[in-house]
């Protein structure tokens, strides 16, 4: 798979492959994988990809199921790259506060908050 | 501050305090703090709170500015709790795939993806 495929297209294709291979993937009925108990997905990327690793090691490879796991690995690479960009730019306090304000604003309006 | 205050109310109050104390917080003109370069805030919580720590250590404490940093510390505690819940529940593959599908769906529709 060319790594040049836009990430947005990669995610769409992966969703389709996930549907296609669902039956094969759930073949192991005894396997248990950690599942986050909330919907703030970005907080759980590490655990999600650990789960994907567990699933891959238990899945018979071949055909387009390999493409699914390759795609998921590229998505992980993208997310790791985004995480690296969390601390790259050193800015004045005012700009940090604008970012913090936006973060709290998004937390206020978009996060699923259980008290 | 009672830690029993609902997190959503805590976030709202913190946004207000951030506005109130902005002038005091930006008093150090030469201080530089890492600012994430994308809007996927949840990926960057660690760096955001490191930045808050840097800011707190450089800010003259007293009055309600202390309450601001106390609030931010409680928000961090909430997020750390959410992170702990990422791997607590072990579930069947089918359930993990449902979560993965939802994660990719959200990534597809809500994330700001720069290729």
């Amino acid at each position: 798979i060319p790594t040049e495929i836009p990430t947005s297209a990669l995610v769409k294709e992966t969703l389709a492959l996930l549907s296609t291979h669902r039956t094969l993937l759930i073949a192991n009925e005894t396997l248990r994988i950690p599942v986050p108990v909330h919907k703030n997905h970005q907080l759980c990327t590490e655990e999600i990809f650990q789960g994907i690793g567990t699933l891959e090691s238990q899945t018979v490879q071949g055909g387009t199921v390999e493409r699914l796991f390759k795609n998921l690995s590229l998505i992980k690479k993208y997310i790791d790259g985004q995480k690296k960009k969390c601390g790259e730019e050193r800015r004045r306090v005012n700009q940090f506060l604008d970012y913090l304000q936006e973060f709290l604003g998004v937390m206020n309006t978009e996060w699923i908050i259980e008290s | 501050i009672p830690t029993e205050i609902p997190t959503s109310a805590l976030v709202k109050e913190t946004l207000a305090l951030l506005s109130t104390h902005r002038t005091l917080l930006i008093a150090n003109e030469t201080l530089r703090i890492p600012v994430p370069v994308h809007k996927n805030h949840q990926l960057c919580t660690e760096e955001i709170f490191q930045g808050i720590g840097t800011l707190e250590s450089q800010t003259v404490q007293g009055g309600t500015v202390e309450r601001l940093f106390k609030n931010l510390s409680l928000i961090k505690k909430y997020i750390d709790g959410q992170k702990k819940k990422c791997g607590e529940e072990r579930r069947r593959v089918n359930q993990f795939l449902d979560y993965l599908q939802e994660f990719l769906g959200v990534m597809n529709t809500e994330w700001i993806i720069e290729s």
Epitope: E88, E89, R90, R91, R92, N94, Q95, D98, Y99, Q101, E102, G105 | R22, T23, I26, A27, E29, T30, R32, V35, P36, V37, H38, K39, I112, E114
Partner: antibody, heavy 117, light 109 residues
Framework: QVQLQESGPGLVKPSQTLSLTCTVS??????????WSWIRQHPGKGLEWIGY???????YYNPSLKSRVTISVDTSKNQFSLKLSSVTAADTAVYYC?????????WGQGTLVTVSS | SYVLTQPPSVSVAPGQTARITCGGN??????VYWYQQKPGQAPVLVVH???DRPSGIPERFSGSNSGNTATLTISRVEVGDEADYSC???????????FGGGTKLTVLG
């Protein structure tokens, strides 16, 4: 490499509103490390900062122009815009858009706007 | 609001040292940025944070800042250095940007 390009009319009538758009390429306007700014330069004079905006919509304006200036951002188009109302001949200048981190990193080539009837 | 004062012009012979000043109340407590602008072109940063040079800017360009004056120094001046030079600071706590009026550097001869 981030590139910026100003666009808009080169001639505006007195008392009307000057409108310019800056299109950002080679980078995202949602980059949290940057503000997006407008600067102008009157013929033969120094640089004058007009204002800047954060992707979240926070704005900062030059106090001397604040009553007439509006800067907005459209993250979906990777653009930000300047509106300057009630213009006079004194607003004739080259208008630059620029990215602003700790300093002005990247600039557009500038566009001359003349205010004349 | 904060005011930065620059001399309108500075003249220097090739090979000599040019010093361009930027005056402001207690400017030494602020970070100063210097831009070079040639006719018909957009400005280019030559010094940031008082004395740091961006990559691609010759070592001949240096800066200093203390008290009420910041200085851009160009050693071994070349004809190609002829341009307008502007200083810039952030005005706290408003976080407004302030530019000096600009200095025209003329290289004689």
């Amino acid at each position: 490499q981030v590139q910026l390009q100003e666009s808009g009319p080169g001639l505006v009538k007195p008392s009307q509103t000057l409108s310019l758009t800056c299109t950002v390429s080679g980078g995202s306007i949602s980059n949290g490390g940057y503000y997006w700014s407008w600067i102008r330069q009157h013929p033969g004079k120094g640089l004058e900062w007009i204002g800047y905006i954060y992707y979240s919509g926070s704005t900062y304006y030059n106090p001397s122009l604040k009553s007439r200036v509006t800067i907005s951002v459209d993250t979906s188009k990777n653009q930000f815009s300047l509106k300057l109302s009630s213009v006079t001949a004194a607003d004739t200048a080259v208008y630059y858009c620029a990215s602003l981190g700790n300093w002005f990193d990247y600039w557009g080539q500038g566009t001359l706007v003349t205010v004349s009837s | 609001s904060y005011v930065l004062t620059q001399p309108p012009s500075v003249s220097v012979a090739p090979g000599q040292t040019a010093r361009i000043t930027c005056g402001g109340n207690n400017i030494g407590s602020k970070n100063v940025y210097w831009y070079q602008q040639k006719p018909g072109q957009a400005p280019v940063l030559v010094v940031h944070d008082d004395s740091d040079r961006p990559s691609g800017i010759p070592e001949r360009f240096s800066g200093s800042n203390s008290g009420n004056t910041a200085t851009l120094t160009i050693s071994r001046v070349e004809v190609g250095d002829e341009a307008d030079y502007s200083c810039q600071v952030w005005d706290s706590p408003s976080d407004h940007v302030v530019f000096g009026g600009g200095t025209k550097l003329t290289v004689l001869g």
